[in-house]
């Protein structure tokens, strides 16, 4: 089964520093998202080989990429306290697959000693449940699609 290997599990960095997050899969992707988890998960980047990556305006100008969508390293620069959070890779395949998440702790330099990562990966409860079905249903499964609502509010 397809899975996403994500590293590191956790990293503590001072304000202004950079962090690398690596997402590796066995291939066969349409693309890969990096999402910051929370009550309203936020898309940070969408990366697809051969095209210009899509980057959230909050990170524009301070994010770099190396590798390919199958083995992608995302470098976030000039980190701010507000960037603290859990970031997860999501591979878009026939089945959507999530990485285990990277907890990024951005701290004031003088408080580095107070905030340290443990060796444990981020708690699974913080991650969305890995989906198990097809991202693009075949016509014969299309009856499972919800009816289009009359109106749908955007966040």
């Amino acid at each position: 089964a397809q899975e996403v290997q994500q590293s590191p599990h956790c990293t503590t960095v001072p304000v202004g520093a950079s962090v690398n997050i690596t997402c590796s899969t066995s291939g066969g992707l349409r693309g890969i998202y990096l999402r910051q988890l929370g009550p309203q998960p936020q898309d940070i980047i969408y990366y697809e080989d051969g095209v210009v990556p899509t980057t959230d305006r909050r990170f524009r100008g301070r994010i770099d990429f190396s590798g390919s969508q199958d083995n992608l390293t995302i470098t976030m620069h000039r980190l701010q306290l507000s960037d603290t959070g859990t970031y997860t890779c999501q591979a878009i395949t026939e089945v959507n697959v999530y990485g285990s998440g990277t907890l990024v702790l951005v701290t004031e330099e003088q408080s580095q000693g107070w905030h340290r990562c443990s060796d444990a990966p981020p708690r699974a409860s913080a991650l969305p449940a890995p989906p198990t079905g097809s991202a693009l249903p075949d016509p014969q499964t299309a009856s499972a699609l919800p009816d289009p609502p009359a109106a749908s509010a955007l966040p």
């Epitope: 998202y33 089945v95 499972a144 699609l145």
Partner: nanobody, 119 residues
Framework: DVQLVESGGGLVQPGGSLRLSCAFP????????MGWYRQAPGKQRELVGD???????NYADSVKGRFTISRDSAKNTVYLQMNSLKPEDTAVYYC?????????????WGQGTQVTVSS
């Protein structure tokens, strides 16, 4: 309330062309997979095709080589160019915007636009 707005449907003769548009009224357009689905009378809704945030399109076998999906991030709009139309393409066409957070399209839908292919 806000929703996707499709346009461009209508009556066309077999072999003709139409271009459908779907406007996304939100700033996050560039992160969404944009899909086109269709539903013919008495049939299940089916995928026509979709386009990734990066602009790579995927099509159902029944429309490959005839239909083209594109997106314009400056206009927050996705297009479905339909050429060599056949009577079996007659259906209501729906636009879907989906961030692929769940296992099936669950984001935002348009109200649908009718396409009728008939002589």
């Amino acid at each position: 309330d806000v929703q996707l707005v499709e346009s461009g449907g209508g009556l066309v003769q077999p072999g003709g062309s139409l271009r459908l548009s779907c406007a996304f009224p939100g700033s996050a357009f560039s992160f969404y997979f944009m899909g086109w689905y269709r539903q013919a009378p008495g049939k299940q809704r089916e995928l026509v095709g979709d386009i990734t945030p990066g602009g790579t399109a995927n099509y159902a076998d029944s429309v490959k080589g005839r239909f083209t999906i594109s997106r314009d991030s400056a206009k927050n709009t996705v297009y479905l160019q339909m050429n060599s139309l056949k009577p079996e393409d007659t259906a209501v066409y729906y636009c879907n915007a989906d961030r692929r957070v769940t296992i099936r399209p669950d984001g935002y839908w348009g109200q649908g636009t009718q396409v009728t292919v008939s002589s």
